[in-house]
Amino acid sequence: KESCDVQLYIKRQSEHSILAGDPFELECPVKYCANRPHVTWCKLNGTTCVKLEDRQTSWKEEKNISFFILHFEPVLPNDNGSYRCSANFQSNLIESHSTTLYVTDVKSASERPSKDEMASRPWLLYR
C-alpha cells in the first residue's frame, strides 16, 4: 500500500535564477495523507539553517500534492543563497534538499535578458 510518510519533493541541487525587484514564490512540494504537517523554511548560513520566522508563507493545495510557499515581496539582492524546507510529522523532522536562488539586479548586469532569453539561457543571469 501507499506510504503515508510525509515527503518533500525538492530536487537535489535545484536552482532558480531570479531578478531583484520582482515578486517570486519559492515552492516546497509536500506530500501527506491525513493531517497536514507543520512546515517551515530556513536559509543556509554555512552549516546551519536559519529559520525564516518573519517571512510571508502560504499553502497551495492541489489534487495530489500541496505546496508550502515562501513569498519574496519583492526579491532583494540579499535573498541570494540556499533554502530548505522542513516538516514536523509525528515527532519526526523531515528535511528537504536545498534549493538555491541566484539573484541578479539587472541594473548591474551586463545585459538585460528578455523573457525568452531567461527561459532558454538562464546562465545569463548569474554568470
Epitope: P23, E73, P74, P77, R112, P113, S114, K115, E117
Partner: antibody, heavy 119, light 107 residues
Framework: QITLKESGPTLVKPTQTLTLTCTFS??????????VGWIRQPPGKALEWLAQ???????RYSPSLKSRLTITKDTSKNQVVLTMTNMDPVDTATYYC???????????WGQGTLVTVSS | DIQMTQSPSSVSASVGDRVTITCRAS??????LAWYQQKPGKAPKLLIY???GLQSGVPSRFSGSGSGTDFTLTISSLQPEDFATYYC?????????FGPGTKVDIK
Amino acid sequence: QITLKESGPTLVKPTQTLTLTCTFSGFSLSTGGVGVGWIRQPPGKALEWLAQIFWTGDKRYSPSLKSRLTITKDTSKNQVVLTMTNMDPVDTATYYCTHKLGMNYFDYWGQGTLVTVSS
Amino acid sequence: DIQMTQSPSSVSASVGDRVTITCRASQGISSWLAWYQQKPGKAPKLLIYAASGLQSGVPSRFSGSGSGTDFTLTISSLQPEDFATYYCQQANSFPFTFGPGTKVDIK
C-alpha cells in the same frame, strides 16, 4: 529614450469607474526586470503608490485600495491600463505612470494627469 | 505597511547652504531607499537609489547615506534650481511607501 504618457478623463463623477492608460516607448514590458506602475498625488499632498505590473505578468496593489484597482498590460501596444472603481472626491489627484528596472526605484515618470472627482 | 517619516517638514535656506534632510522607516529596510525631487507642477525626479547611489545625470552635490531605519539626504551647496520638495521612498517591501515630503524654500 524612455517616455511614458498618461491619458484618460480629467473629470469623473462619484461612484464611477476611472480608466487610465499609460502609453510608453523606449523599453519593452517583456524585458527582464521591467515594471510599470501607477502613483498618485492629491493636490498639495504626498505621493501614494497604487499598483505595479511586472515583466513576468505579476501584479501588486496597494492593500488599502486593492479591492478597487485592476492593472493590465498590452505588451504589443506598449500600454498599461489602470482601472479604479467607485471613485470618490478623495481620489482627486494627479496620477503618474512610472517605470522601474530592477529594484523598485522609479527612474522614469509620465507628466501626470489630474483627475478630479466631482458631481 | 512600512511607514516613512521625514524631518524637517520644511526648511528655509540660502544659495550655498548645506542642507540635510532625514528620513526614518518604521522598520528596517536595509539600504532599499530612494530620494526624489519634485518641483511644482512637475513629476518627481529620482536623485538617489539604494540609499547612496547617485542616479545618472544628478549633480554630485546631492548625496545620500544611512541604512536600517535612518537615512539622510544632503545637498552640499544649495543651488537656485534645488528649491523643491524632496521625498524618500522605501523599496524593501510591498506596498512601496513614501515619506510626507520636505519642502526646501528660499530664506
